[in-house]
């Protein structure tokens, strides 16, 4: 009696259980009473990641450099290509379909967390006693110069964007 269900890694066709093609291979012809399933390896830039009966392999993802993407890991006959962003850029989504330039922290703000390939720069305002006078994607807030340790006095107060200006102490004549 013809089967109504087949074992794992098999499929039912023409009242017969045929072996599925292994990952990395596509189906050329179904099995018959006398022949095994015929499978063929996927070609260059193609893959299939499951046991299957597909007649065409899937195309590897293209990491478009015009979108700031590059290949992080080449695809194989069984896996898709993994894209990532070029240095200085990060993915706009989990699927990493495009990239945007890392944000810079404006003067008065410092980098709390440096950007990665998947997350943007996190900035924080420079608290009292700290400053940042540049727009940067990696500079933290710097502490004001300590005039006292240099045996100098504060001539101009610091802000979140400028360092203090030190000067010589007034000498008593």
């Amino acid at each position: 009696e013809p089967p109504t269900a087949c074992r794992e890694k098999q499929y039912l066709i023409n009242s017969q259980c045929c072996s599925l093609c292994q990952p990395g291979q596509k189906l050329v012809s179904d099995c018959t009473e006398f022949t095994e399933t015929e499978c063929l390896p996927c070609g260059e830039s193609e893959f299939l990641d499951t046991w299957n009966r597909e007649t065409h392999c899937h195309q590897h993802k293209y990491c478009d450099p015009n979108l700031g993407l590059r290949v992080q890991q080449k695809g194989t006959s069984e896996t898709d290509t993994i894209c990532t962003c070029e240095e200085g850029w990060h993915c706009t989504s989990e699927a990493c379909e495009s990239c945007v330039l890392h944000r810079s922290c404006s003067p008065g703000f410092g980098v709390k967390q440096i950007a990665t390939g998947v997350s943007d720069t996190i900035c924080e305002p420079c608290p009292v006693g700290f400053f940042s006078n540049v727009s940067s994607a990696f500079e933290k807030c710097h502490p004001w110069t300590s005039c006292e340790t240099k045996d100098l006095v504060v001539q101009q107060a610091g802000t979140n964007k400028t360092d203090v200006v030190c000067g010589p102490q007034d000498r008593l004549r």
Epitope: E44, C63, P65, R70, V71, Q72, K74, T76, S77, E86
Partner: antibody, heavy 119, light 109 residues
């Protein structure tokens, strides 16, 4: 389509040297480029590759000593710092098969330029 | 560290004969392997990419096969013009998996 390397010369150990690859009929905005070297009587050694975006990757042994950069729409440079006698070789530039990947095969090569490191 | 071992270092065969060159990777590189031919005083010339894809203009006497870690270049019906050094190159994703084999010198008698 052609590639031509220039800048090879006798250099003293510890100095620095920049080689230039000038391309003709090749669009550097759509083709990745690589540098490969070959010591006298030795095999081929991949140095590094530059993608169309300007991103680079290097062989582990080459990191920090070699820098690849795109200097114009028709030139790619290889800068070598602190060379030793082991760096004596013919240096080839070659076109990579992909524009977005550092790990490529090379389908067009220049004739090479000889660098001799000696005191 | 990744290694690409090419054997033999040298092989000799007569005109019309066949030579087989092997290339072994220390880890799987799927099918990302290319073969080059280099003659003295000349740059390498790409023969085969992705294990078995023949470059345009290369005769079908050159045949590449393999996958994973074991690869082979077979040259049949040898001609005098085939005398050269042959290199395999892996180009999988990894700093040191973009490397060349040590080369095989083919001498045609």
């Amino acid at each position: 389509q052609s590639l031509e390397e220039s800048g090879g010369r006798l250099v003293t150990p510890g100095g620095s040297l920049t080689l230039t690859c000038t391309v003709s009929g090749i669009d550097l905005s759509t083709n990745g480029m690589g540098w490969v070297r070959q010591g006298p009587g030795k095999g081929l050694e991949w140095i590094g590759t530059i993608r169309v975006t300007g991103g680079t990757d290097y062989a582990t042994w080459a990191k920090g000593r070699f820098t690849i950069s795109k200097t114009s729409s028709t030139t790619v440079d290889l800068k070598m710092t602190s060379p030793t006698t082991e760096d004596t070789a013919t240096y080839f530039c070659a076109r990579g098969h992909a524009n977005n990947d550092a790990y490529v095969y090379f389908n067009l090569w220049g004739q090479g330029t000889l660098v001799t490191v000696s005191s | 560290a990744f290694e690409l071992t090419q054997t033999p270092a040298s092989v000799e065969a007569g005109v019309g004969g066949t030579v087989t060159i092997k290339c072994q990777a220390s880890q799987s590189i799927d099918r990302y392997l290319a073969w080059y031919q280099q003659k003295p005083g000349q740059p390498p010339k790409l023969l085969i990419s992705y294990t078995s894809t023949l470059t345009s203009g290369v005769p079908s006497r050159f045949k590449g096969s393999g996958s994973g870690t074991e690869f082979t270049l077979t040259i049949s019906d040898l001609e005098c013009a085939d005398a050269a050094t042959y290199y395999c190159q892996s180009y999988f994703t990894s700093d040191d998996a973009n490397t060349f084999g040590g080369g095989t010198e083919v001498v045609v008698k």
